[in-house]
Structure formats: C-alpha cells, structure tokens
C-alpha cells in the first residue's frame, strides 16, 4: 500500500513522491533501505531529498533500489517506500514496455495526451512530443500546457507518445522523457434511445441478510463511440454518492461492445452486509445519453437460506 | 497540554434528544480530524462518527446513521455530536478523540482521547 | 465492514510473565493496525500504530507485530500496571471497528 515503483533512463533527472502522505508542516527523511544510510538534503548532492521528493538530478544505472522515507509529525513517524529502477538508454528506437506508463485512450471529440509525473517537476513550456521517436510536426499536433492536443484523431494515432521536458533545478537544466500508449477508438457509429438489459422492469431480486448482493444495471446506447453515455443506480430516487450508505457502492463494470457492435456499459451496485431495511428501498437502474432516459426499477426481496439440515437428515 | 473535554450527557428518555460537545485546548483544532467513539456499560468500544479537519467530510457508523451528526466549530475549538431519536442500545459513555495524521480521505489512530460523558437512554 | 478478532478473551497471568495477544481481521488492512490499553474508568490510550510503532512515551516491553489479518501484541514482562483491557483497531478504511478486547488479568 505504501510502496510505489518508480523508473526513469540514466542522465535523465528522476523526482519520486514519498507514497506514505502527510501534512505539508511534516518533516520527511530519505534512506537507502538496504544500507539504512541517510539520503543528503543538500542540493550539491546528485541524488538529494526535497521534503515529500526524492530528486536523482541526473539519474545512474545503479541508483537502482528501494528508497525509505519517513514521513515524521510531531508525535508520530509513518514509513514508505518508493522501489527505484534505472535503466540505460535504449540504443534504437522501441520503448520497452517497463518504461511505459498507463495508455490513454482518445477519440475524435476528446485527444488529450498527457504527459505523466510532469507534475512533479519544475519545468517550463513548450514540451517536445514525439510519436514511435519521430518528433510530430504539423498543425494537428498542439502543445498546450502539460498534455497533447491531436486534431481530427484518427484510427492511425494510435501508438508510442514520448514527451519531453526539461527539469530546472537551481539553474541547472536536465532532461526528463516518458512514454505511453495512445489508443484511439472508433468514433463511427449511432447513437439511440438507451436500451436496458438488465435488470428486467419491476424485478425482484432475492437476497439474503448479512451477505452481500450485486445488482447489475447493464445498458446499450448505439453503436461505436458514445458522446454522452451513462448508467447509475439511484436509492429511492437519490444519487448513490448522496444517499450516505457507506454499505450500498456503485461500481462501473466494463465498457462492452458486443458482436454485433453496440456500446454498452455496466454499473454494478454492491450491497455489503445487507440488512432488513436494505428491502424497504427501491432501487433504478437509469440509462441516460443525448435521446433522453430509462429507468427500470429493482426490489429486494429476502430470499431464506437453504436449511442443511433438512436436506442431509 | 492537549486536552479534550466532553459535556453535555445526561439521562434523556427513548425518542429524545441530547447534544454533546467537546472543547479542546492545546492544539491547532481546526486542522485535525474529530471522532466520537462510546462503550455501553461494561462493553468494548464502539466507532461513532468522525468529522474530517479543515471543513472536511464526515462519516457515521450503521448503527447512528440519520439519527446522529457530527458537526464542529474551529472558531470556538468545539466538537459536537447531535443525537436525535435515541434509544436504549445509544446508552454509553462517549469520548471525543483526535486523529493526529488526517490526510484527505484517510484515517488514522486515537492519540488523545477525553474522560467521556455519560449518556443514559431510559424511560 | 471489517471484523477484528481478538484472542483470547481473557489472559490470566503474573506479574513479570509474558503477555501474547492475538488480534485477526476478517480482510487485510495491511498495516494500518493500532493497539490501545484501557483501565477501568479511563479512557483508552494509544500503544502501538501502524501494527508495530510504539506510540510517544510507551514503555519498550510492548512491541507488535504483524501484517495484513494476522497482528500480535507482546507484553515481554508484566508490570502490575499493564493489567488492564487491551484493543485492537483498523483504520484502513470506514467503519473504523474495534476488537472486543482481551483482559489481561492478575493470576
């Protein structure tokens, strides 16, 4: 839970965030886990700690490790750990994937890239964008801020993205790159009045008290890439996020298209420990895009376990 | 000195209402989580409810939900517990306690805790 | 919600004998486990958190242990004032809960 991994290329400025969180008055100090050796805070120092950051300024192959930081209030010391991995540049053009951070997914109508960690650097604009290592140029790529803007997305964006930046450390300038995946995805298609799976209109579904109970509500909105798709459950006509039932979560299933190509999508509504007043409630399903809503309402009903003793005597 | 003063039990019949509060003193307030925790006589303790420092959240346990809220003043170094509706199973002693960390959507453990207050629920 | 269980319910021992109190949650809260003491009339008072640190001013004959479901709290000799109730405590996530508490009583 308090250990984060954590990458970068050598001769390229590396900065980690100590994973364990604490008030911006705490103190934090850094150590080399396996030698229990004090990490300088002094900015001469290649690898220096910054309060909450660890700063590599430039990074070496055999900084390698894991890095403890001790996040200390008052009364009180907590512990993490960022588990630190350098690797030497690759000599041809291929990001390997354990440099790749998470991909993004875009569409005609939303092509942001952002460029990750940049957050935790001192840095200035414009940031370079390179595509499978072959720098982007032309009016459908646009630089703004911390992220990429590509016009008119297209099926054949999808790849690498490098962004590349520059780390200003007490008029020192280093490097910094990072890579992710970009997807794009099918913006062709229709659009129609939602139509829902499940649950069936007016059912009731048998639960048992004390255990837990999933109630799926799985709807289809058209084919391809939806501009406003969304499925929720209410309580009682309440948003779930209002209602105030820590017990009662809504969680989003994944986004399906199925064979014959419509979008649809799940919400899953976990009800844990359910209790008596869990079946006074009634609880819809609502489907809702730019044609307009649905909604199927859903009750609970006490379903009485199977006595095994009846059966086995 | 930290401290942590609960007042405001009492005896009160089912279906009443009481309002409990808690002052502190020796600490900046208004930064840190509040949390009331109670014990039924002779029982172990029991999570209550916790307010979230700096205007934050609160969160209540199943068994006070719609019935209890948690509120605070950080200009009075005040923390209250509002009960409505109380019943025989709400009769116990109740402490204000602090949560030292209380990062944004966290939790943590009781440093400091007051003496308790004493709330009966009987006909 | 996550259940804490404590064992065992009571401990009968003598002074300067070794306590083991045994705490088990229902899921992992890995280690976001704190112990507390608790003399009749008071109010508890924080020992240990994050499943192994002494809280500020504790003695060194309590030290815990412990990851994920399974935590332990060691009392290596008991002083005639460490008999008292003893609770464990998750805060890894809402409902905080508490185990019912183990007694650790004079034999």
């Known amino acids: 839970k308090f250990s984060k991994q954590s990458w970068g290329l050598e001769n390229e400025a590396l900065i980690v965030r100590c994973p364990r969180q604490g008030k911006p008055s705490y103190t934090v100090d850094w150590y080399y886990s396996q030698t229990n050796k004090s990490i300088p805070t002094q900015e001469r120092n290649r690898v220096f700690a910054s309060g909450q950051l660890l700063k590599f300024l430039p990074a070496a192959v055999a900084d390698s490790g894991i890095y403890t930081c001790i996040v200390r209030s008052p009364t009180f010391n907590r512990t993490g750990y960022a588990n630190v991995t350098i690797y030497k540049k690759q000599s041809d053009c291929n990001v390997p994937d354990y440099l790749m951070y998470s991909t993004v997914s875009g569409s005609e109508k939303n092509s942001k890239i952002y460029c990750p960690t940049i957050d935790l650097y001192n840095w200035t604009a414009p940031l370079e964008w390179f595509k499978n290592c072959q720098a982007l140029q032309g009016s459908r790529y646009r630089a703004h801020k911390s992220f990429l803007v590509i016009d008119n997305v297209m099926t054949e964006d999808a790849g690498d993205y490098t962004c590349k930046f520059i780390h200003n450390e007490n008029g020192a300038n280093y490097s910094v790159t990072a890579t992710r995946s970009f997807t794009v995805k099918d913006e062709q298609g229709f659009s129609l009045f939602p139509v829902i799976g499940a649950p069936a209109q007016n059912e009731i579904k048998e639960v048992e008290i004390g255990k837990n109970a999933n109630l799926t509500c799985s709807a289809c909105f058209g084919k391809g890439t939806q501009f406003l798709a969304a499925v929720l459950w209410q309580l009682n006509g309440t948003k779930i996020t209002d209602f105030g039932e820590p017990r009662i979560q809504q969680e989003e299933g994944q986004n399906q298209s199925f064979s014959n190509g419509l979008a649809c999508l799940d919400m899953v509504l976990r009800i844990a420990d359910v209790k008596e007043e869990d079946l006074l409630l009634q609880y819809d399903c609502l489907a809702l895009n730019l044609h307009g809503l649905r909604r199927h309402t859903v009750r609970l009903s006490r379903k009485n376990p199977i006595d095994h003793h009846s059966i086995y005597c | 000195e930290v401290q942590l003063l609960e007042s405001g039990g009492g005896l009160v019949q089912p279906g009443g209402s009481l309002r409990l509060s808690c002052a502190a003193s020796?600490?900046?307030?208004?930064?840190?989580?509040m949390i009331w925790v109670r014990q039924a006589p002779g029982k172990g303790l029991e999570w209550v409810s916790t307010?979230?420092?700096?205007?934050?959240?609160?969160y209540y346990a199943d068994s006070v939900k719609g019935r209890f809220t948690i509120s605070r003043d950080n200009s009075k170094n005040t923390l209250y517990l509002q009960m409505n509706s109380l019943r025989a199973e709400d009769t116990a002693v109740y402490y204000c306690?602090?949560?030292?960390?209380?990062?944004?959507?966290?939790?943590?453990?009781?440093?400091?805790w007051g003496q308790g207050t004493l709330v009966t629920v009987s006909s | 919600e996550i259940v804490l269980t404590q064992s065992p319910a009571t401990l009968s021992l003598s002074p300067g004998e070794r306590a083991t109190l045994s705490c088990r949650a229902s899921?992992?809260?890995?280690?976001?486990l704190a112990w507390y003491q608790q003399k009749p009339g008071q109010a508890p008072r924080l020992l240990i958190y994050?499943?192994?640190n002494r809280a500020t001013g504790i003695p060194a004959r309590f030290s815990g242990s412990g990851s994920g479901t399974d935590f332990t709290l060691t009392i290596s000799s008991l002083e005639p004032e460490d008999f008292a109730v003893y609770y464990c405590q998750q805060y890894i996530t809402a409902p905080l809960t508490f185990g019912q508490g183990t007694k650790v009583e004079i034999k």
């Open positions: 994050d499943a192994s």
């Open positions: 306690a602090r949560d030292p960390w209380s990062t944004e959507g966290s939790f943590f453990v009781l440093d400091y």
């Open positions: 307010i979230k420092g700096e205007g934050g959240g609160t």
């Open positions: 899921q992992s809260v890995d280690d976001d």
């Open positions: 020796g600490f900046t307030f208004s930064i840190y989580d």
